[in-house]
């Protein structure tokens, strides 16, 4: 459906408020260092221009593509060269290369100050003084720190953010009302960002086919009563939405996502019985709800897959006629029968099936060759089951903090070249799998755990890609999307690593640790633990535990002392000496 003016089309479809918000998100995700005021100015200019195009679609420049319009606007930023360096070279390119260039310069770990939450009264005053600016600032700060955040979903977060302030700034105890809501939004936001980052990595690094396979498996688990043709249609539409958002086409993405939600709700009878409540909600809530909806019940009676995918004499004929359709049907049929499997496991099974058919359909007796293909699935299924069982037992025994520490040690020994902040962040998130998934019954543990681990390991992959330091990380990240977790699990201690020189400064602590939150204090201790392992990769669990116990006692003692700083200085020296002796440094 060609429109004379794309910008007018999107402005009319989305409405002014959403249009402005999405353009702000797009600009902040591209130019992550630009001040808020500069972005607001650019957004206002684009909005005014869009309005002229709505009034007259034939007006000058209204026929230009959104990439051209937005790229031209971004390239007017005066400080582009000094702020962004080589990114300024993008402006010398023509579309579509210019947009590709901007995309390549998105920074997953921008050098931006940590967001510090002001006092509640200060926030409420700012909210009341200028609600619009306050909410725009939220969009800007999240978007620039999370350049792949799913834009239509960020609008939903902003709506909840606004609702929290509207309610709580009138409450008797503002802080008690507001702070838990903001904590929840922060945690959900980080999780949402990481999930979307995996979708974009899947599309950008492994291609559309990989993303579509993921979507077939996930939607088939979620909508097991839907026909294969219905699932295929949803997968095609969903792939378009995510391709657009990951490509920076946020207006098209938000518009198409709304169309997809509308289609799903109009056809819920042939999709899922679980959509009724979602479909009664307003647009942003509706789309979010559909994305999170629980799996529908499986049809009452489903046959074994053996008949169609092993025993049929037409297996090779059907495969040869339309390989991806046949494999898609296999994946659909398997996934709808197994909501208890992770998506990545289902994809491994489909890959094994594909490899077997590739080999066997060229053999003298194809049927004899692929007759036992389902037996090859057994080790693939049992590996994550056993791993989850062992790690949930360990989590239940240790609790979250110590479980994170066990993972910190494990991963630092596997890939000691990775930066300490990245190891701490990734291992802490890996450790959260325990409290997130181990509480679930067996049938829900694997999809919860392994698909969550895929999201966390993708964080490691994108952070490592920015400054690659480990061939082992590169190998696990790039060889196979679905085998990333098994690849990292299989890594042993890196015997080639030369231990880091001991630096007493790394283990020098000050009284400021006493005023930190429990979480921040844990991060300090976990940072020290990673550094210890980097100095002494051969250290045993017992040695590391002893040093960490001493460290915890040292912090507790000095935080209770009258002269904290002196205590940290004197006791710190003793602790370093004792630790060196204990570890044989």
């Amino acid at each position: 459906d060609a429109h004379k003016s794309e910008v007018a089309h999107r402005f009319k479809d989305l409405g002014e408020e959403n249009f402005k918000a999405l353009v702000l998100i797009a600009f902040a995700q591209y130019l992550q260092q630009c001040p808020f005021e500069d972005h607001v100015k650019l957004v206002n200019e684009v909005t005014e221009f869009a309005k002229t195009c709505v009034a007259d679609e034939s007006a000058e420049n209204c026929d230009k593509s959104l990439h051209t319009l937005f790229g031209d606007k971004l390239c007017t930023v005066a400080t582009l060269r000094e702020t962004y360096g080589e990114m300024a070279d993008c402006c010398a390119k023509q579309e579509p290369e210019r947009n590709e260039c901007f995309l390549q310069h998105k920074d997953d770990n921008p050098n931006l100050p940590r967001l510090v939450r002001p006092e509640v009264d200060v926030m409420c005053t700012a909210f009341h003084d200028n609600e619009e600016t306050f909410l725009k600032k939220y969009l800007y700060e999240i978007a620039r720190r999370h350049p792949y955040f799913y834009a239509p979903e960020l609008l939903f977060f902003a709506k909840r953010y606004k609702a929290a302030f509207t309610e709580c700034c009138q409450a008797a105890d503002k802080a008690a009302c507001l702070l838990p809501k903001l904590d929840e939004l922060r945690d959900e936001g980080k999780a949402s960002s990481a999930k979307q980052r995996l979708k974009c990595a899947s599309l950008q690094k492994f291609g559309e086919r990989a993303f579509k396979a993921w979507a077939v498996a996930r939607l088939s688990q979620r909508f097991p009563k839907a026909e294969f043709a219905e699932v295929s249609k949803l997968v095609t539409d969903l792939t378009k939405v995510h391709t657009e958002c990951c490509h920076g086409d946020l207006l098209e993405c938000a518009d198409d996502r709304a169309d997809l939600a509308k289609y799903i709700c109009e056809n819920q009878d042939s999709i899922s019985s679980k959509l009724k409540e979602c479909c009664e909600k307003p647009l942003l809530e509706k789309s979010h709800c559909i994305a999170e909806v629980e799996n529908d019940e499986m049809p009452a009676d489903l046959p074994s897959l053996a008949a169609d995918f092993v025993e049929s004499k037409d297996v090779c004929k059907n495969y040869a006629e339309a390989k991806d359709v046949f494999l898609g049907m296999f994946l659909y049929e398997y996934a709808r029968r197994h909501p208890d499997y992770s998506v990545v496991l289902l994809l491994r099974l489909a890959k094994t099936y594909e490899t077997t058919l590739e080999k066997c359909c060229a053999a003298a007796d194809p049927h004899e060759c692929y007759a036992k293909v389902f037996d090859e699935f057994k080790p693939l299924v049992e590996e994550p089951q056993n791993l989850i069982k062992q790690n949930c037992e360990l989590f239940e025994q240790l609790g979250e903090y110590k479980f994170q520490n066990a993972l910190l040690v494990r991963y630092t020994k596997k890939v000691p070249q990775v930066s300490t902040p990245t190891l701490v962040e990734v291992s802490r998130n890996l450790g959260k799998v325990g409290s997130k998934c181990c509480k679930h019954p067996e049938a829900k543990r694997m999809p919860c755990a392994e698909d969550y681990l895929s999201v966390v390991l993708n964080q490691l992959c994108v952070l490592h890609e920015k400054t690659p330091v480990s061939d082992r990380v590169t190998k696990c990240c790039t060889e196979s999307l679905v085998n990333r977790r098994p690849c990292f699990s299989a890594l042993e201690v890196d015997e080639t690593y030369v231990p880091k020189e001991f630096n007493a400064e790394t283990f020098t602590f000050h009284a400021d640790i006493c005023t930190l939150s429990e979480k921040e204090r844990q991060i300090k201790k976990q940072t020290a633990l990673v550094e210890l392992v980097k100095h002494k990769p051969k250290a045993t669990k017992e040695q590391l535990k002893a040093v960490m116990d001493d460290f915890a006692a040292f912090v507790e003692k000095c935080c209770k002392a009258d002269d904290k700083e002196t205590c940290f200085a004197e006791e710190g020296k003793k602790l370093v000496a004792a630790s060196q002796a204990a570890l044989g440094l």
């Epitope: 489903l302 046959p303 074994s304 897959l305 197994h338 208890d340 699935f377």
Partner: nanobody, 123 residues
Framework: DVQLVESGGGVVQAGGSLRLSCAAS????????MGWFRQAPGKERERVVS????????YYADSVKGRFTISRDNAENTVYLQMNSLKPEDTALYYC????????????????WGQGTLVQVSS
Amino acid sequence: DVQLVESGGGVVQAGGSLRLSCAASGLTFSSYAMGWFRQAPGKERERVVSISRGGGYTYYADSVKGRFTISRDNAENTVYLQMNSLKPEDTALYYCAAARYWATGSEYEFDYWGQGTLVQVSS
């Protein structure tokens, strides 16, 4: 606690018949696909037959097709295996198993297992 209790095994002449039963308790029977597996001395456990939750679909190993019949009674929480034209190579310990989710009828899909009942076919 989930329990699967097999019965009906015994010694039989080649060409004879036996009917195995498996009574299930502690689970929502109609939510589980059921299967029979067997293990002969010194051999790996192999799948014999399985049946879908509603009983509408069955899956037989080639070696027993036309001779064995699986059925289930969801009201009685019981699955049956009618074995006809028995052969000496059918001698094995027969296990009943339950699968919450069932795609291929392979052993790894089954969540709960009985202790087994012995079938001996003499020539």
